[in-house]
Interface confidence: low
């Protein structure tokens, strides 16, 4: 082992501390970058929201038109009764069999009770409900109700989170320009270096100690920030755990129906079974029964209903897509808040640590280069450092980076910081 003089150790500590100093700056800038990202995401969310409002209006108009057509059609006297009833009698057993097969395969719970309930439901249902696509209309209305509820919930939580974020970002910590980063604390102890944490801040100012020699409690200074970030996170997270969001239509939307929804509908009131009508020829035939010879106006209304139903379904899908994008924006903001929380924790921790008496953030205590007869691989340098208030940290530097290399202390400091942060996270 080559011995290293105290002067060399001091110079190494100096270089290492410079690197740590730079990392602290980066940490502060990191917080500001996240702030910018959150603001950008919020702008995108606002644009999305206005698109959503527009899509919602179009969808509501189409739904109203569909409802009107349905009402007019219901008011007309029943025609083609015999044809429809005959087809309905043949459609029912097929529908029941298909539905029970699906239920047994997919829904994984007793089908006895469901079978009886379905029998009853089919006996009470009218082929006209079928012919008018009543199940599709009901499904659209239910979808509309869920979508409205979901957007309301999201909006409510986002506006709560937003007001907290706005308050947080009004603080001088976030508004100060980067060139102001170095700032002498007016009440610092002798020999302290320039600092990045801002006593002019609303929060810090209110907590300023009376005596210039009382050590600053940076944890108390930053605690309100951390609490606000946490509060904003909570406001954002609530809706992702509420029942409406357990299986939102926006989570991996498929053109087909989500199994859980279908199973729930079958258990609830058997309507889910009507979704399987396409698999029964006689049921499909009901949909194509032409009653125009008996009543031309009925055929016209039926056509109108079909058209408005298609438009309403298309607009509902479009709205769902926008709702999905909106939810992703929310999730994105949520994860940015998580990053902000972690980064801020780290910044506040560093702020506290840099208040120590030692002029070095990083102090090198021993350096040992190993020869081939030791346990450590030949040529590797082992450096023991103390970082802030930490226990000694041992860092190994590969043979490629010699002690004379300007990158040597940067490597040591980087590894030590990583180790320190890892330990801090585990605590």
């Amino acid at each position: 082992d080559q011995t290293v003089s105290d002067n060399e150790l001091q110079e190494m500590s100096n270089q290492g501390s410079k690197y740590v100093n730079k990392e602290i700056q980066n940490a502060v800038n990191g917080v500001k970058q996240i702030k910018t990202l959150i603001e950008k995401t919020n702008e995108e969310r606002k644009t999305l929201l206005s698109n959503l409002e527009e899509a919602k209006k179009k969808k509501e108009d189409a739904l109203n038109e569909t409802r009107e057509s349905e009402t007019k059609l219901k008011e007309l006297p029943g025609v083609c009764n015999e044809t429809m009833m005959a087809l309905w009698e043949e459609c029912k057993p097929c529908l029941k069999q298909t539905c029970m097969k699906f239920y047994a395969r997919v829904c994984r719970s007793g089908s006895g009770l469901v079978g009886r309930q379905l029998e009853e439901f089919l006996n009470q249902s009218s082929p006209f409900y079928f012919w008018m696509n009543g199940d599709r209309i009901d499904s659209l209305l239910e979808n509309d109700r869920q979508q409205t509820h979901m957007l309301d919930v999201m909006q409510d939580h986002f506006s709560r989170a937003s007001s907290i974020i706005d308050e947080l970002f009004q603080d001088r910590f976030f508004t100060r320009e980067p060139q102001d980063t170095y700032h002498y604390l007016p009440f610092s102890l002798p020999h302290r270096r320039p600092h990045f944490f801002f006593p002019k801040s609303r929060i810090v100012r209110s907590l300023m100690p009376f005596s210039p020699y009382e050590p600053l409690n940076f944890h108390a200074m930053f605690q309100p920030f951390l609490e606000m970030i946490h509060e904003a996170q909570q406001a954002m997270d609530i809706h992702f755990h509420s029942p409406a969001f357990q299986h939102p239509p926006t989570e991996f939307i498929r053109e087909g129906d989500d199994d859980r929804t279908v199973c729930r509908e079958i258990r609830h009131n058997s309507t889910g079974c009507l979704r399987m009508k396409d698999q029964c020829d006689k049921c499909r035939e009901i949909l194509s029964v032409d009653c125009s010879t008996n009543n031309p106006s009925q055929a016209k209304l039926r056509r109108e209903l079909d058209e408005s139903l298609q438009v309403a379904e298309r607009l509902t899908r479009k709205y769902n897509e926008l709702l999905k994008s909106y939810q992703w924006k929310m999730l994105n903001t949520s994860s940015l808040l998580e990053q902000l929380n972690e980064q801020f924790n780290w910044v506040s921790r560093l702020a506290n640590l840099t208040q120590g008496e030692d002029q070095y953030y990083l102090r090198v205590t021993t350096v040992a280069s190993h020869t081939s007869d030791s346990d450590v691989p030949s040529g590797v340098t082992e450096v023991v450092v103390k970082l802030f208030d930490s226990d000694p940290i041992t860092v190994t530097v590969p043979v490629e980076v010699s002690r004379k290399n300007p990158k040597f202390m940067e490597t040591v400091a980087e590894k030590a910081l990583q180790e320190y942060r890892k330990k801090h996270r585990e605590e």
Epitope: R105, D259, D278
Partner: antibody, heavy 120, light 107 residues
């Protein structure tokens, strides 16, 4: 956006075992079955089996029972397939593919495939 | 097991033309058939499921029909990007089975 990212190509010796992975993202991992499909050098496709990530229960094509073992790690949204006692017959491209439990949905999203070569 | 017999195994057609591929199941599969397009180095792409339902984003040039044991798949107005191998898949039975594939080339 739904994505299935499979692990890289594997070169193994006869008799060895190999475990390939399929990392899923962009959807609720436990809500949908993960299938595994084999393709022998450009020939047709063969269904190996599937697994329901919610319960971790696999179904196997009888032909691949004892050869393939399907597992999932819910925490990382990753599905795995282990192939044991490898022979040259197992040299193929293996795909993971997604389908909902609803039979109206076939396997609609596929991974890019993992090539396994068995050679001494 | 349900066997799926796909024909032809390869075919060549002109741009703008139409091709039809058929699959015959060894038993009734209740319309539970899907059609895939497979290009080298990629995972298969689902075009049609439940006999004739087009996947979102798939052009209407692709179509499917059939019932019972006999099913067919067509591509009209052929385009260069349609060069691929096409497979049918039955999923009526938990043990899914594929057809042997049809390699499509452009004349």
């Amino acid at each position: 956006e739904v994505q299935l990212q499979q692990s890289g190509p594997e070169l193994e010796k006869p008799g060895a075992s190999v475990k390939i992975s399929c990392k899923a993202s962009g959807y609720s991992f436990t809500g949908y079955n993960m299938n595994w499909v084999k393709q022998n050098n450009g020939k047709s496709l063969e269904w190996i089996g599937n697994i329901d990530p919610y319960y971790g229960t696999p179904n196997y094509n009888q032909k691949f029972k004892g050869k393939a073992t399907l597992t999932v790690d819910k925490s990382s949204s990753t599905a795995y397939m282990q192939l044991k006692s490898l022979t040259s017959e197992d040299s193929a491209v293996y795909y993971c593919a997604l389908n909902s439990l609803l039979r109206l949905n076939a396997m609609d999203y596929w991974g890019q495939g993992t090539s396994v070569t068995v050679s001494s | 097991d349900i066997q799926m017999t796909q024909s032809p195994s390869s075919l060549s057609a002109s741009l703008g033309g139409k091709v039809t591929i058929t699959c015959k199941a060894s038993q009734d599969i209740n319309k539970y058939i899907a059609w895939y397009q497979h290009k080298p180095g990629k995972g298969p792409r689902l075009l049609i499921h439940y006999t004739s339902t087009l996947q979102p984003g798939i052009p209407s040039r692709f179509s499917g029909s059939g019932s019972g044991r006999d099913y067919s798949f067509s591509i009209s107005n052929l385009e260069p990007e349609d060069i691929a191998t096409y497979y049918c898949l039955q999923y009526d039975n938990l043990l899914r089975t594929f057809g042997g594939g049809t390699k499509l080339e452009i004349k």
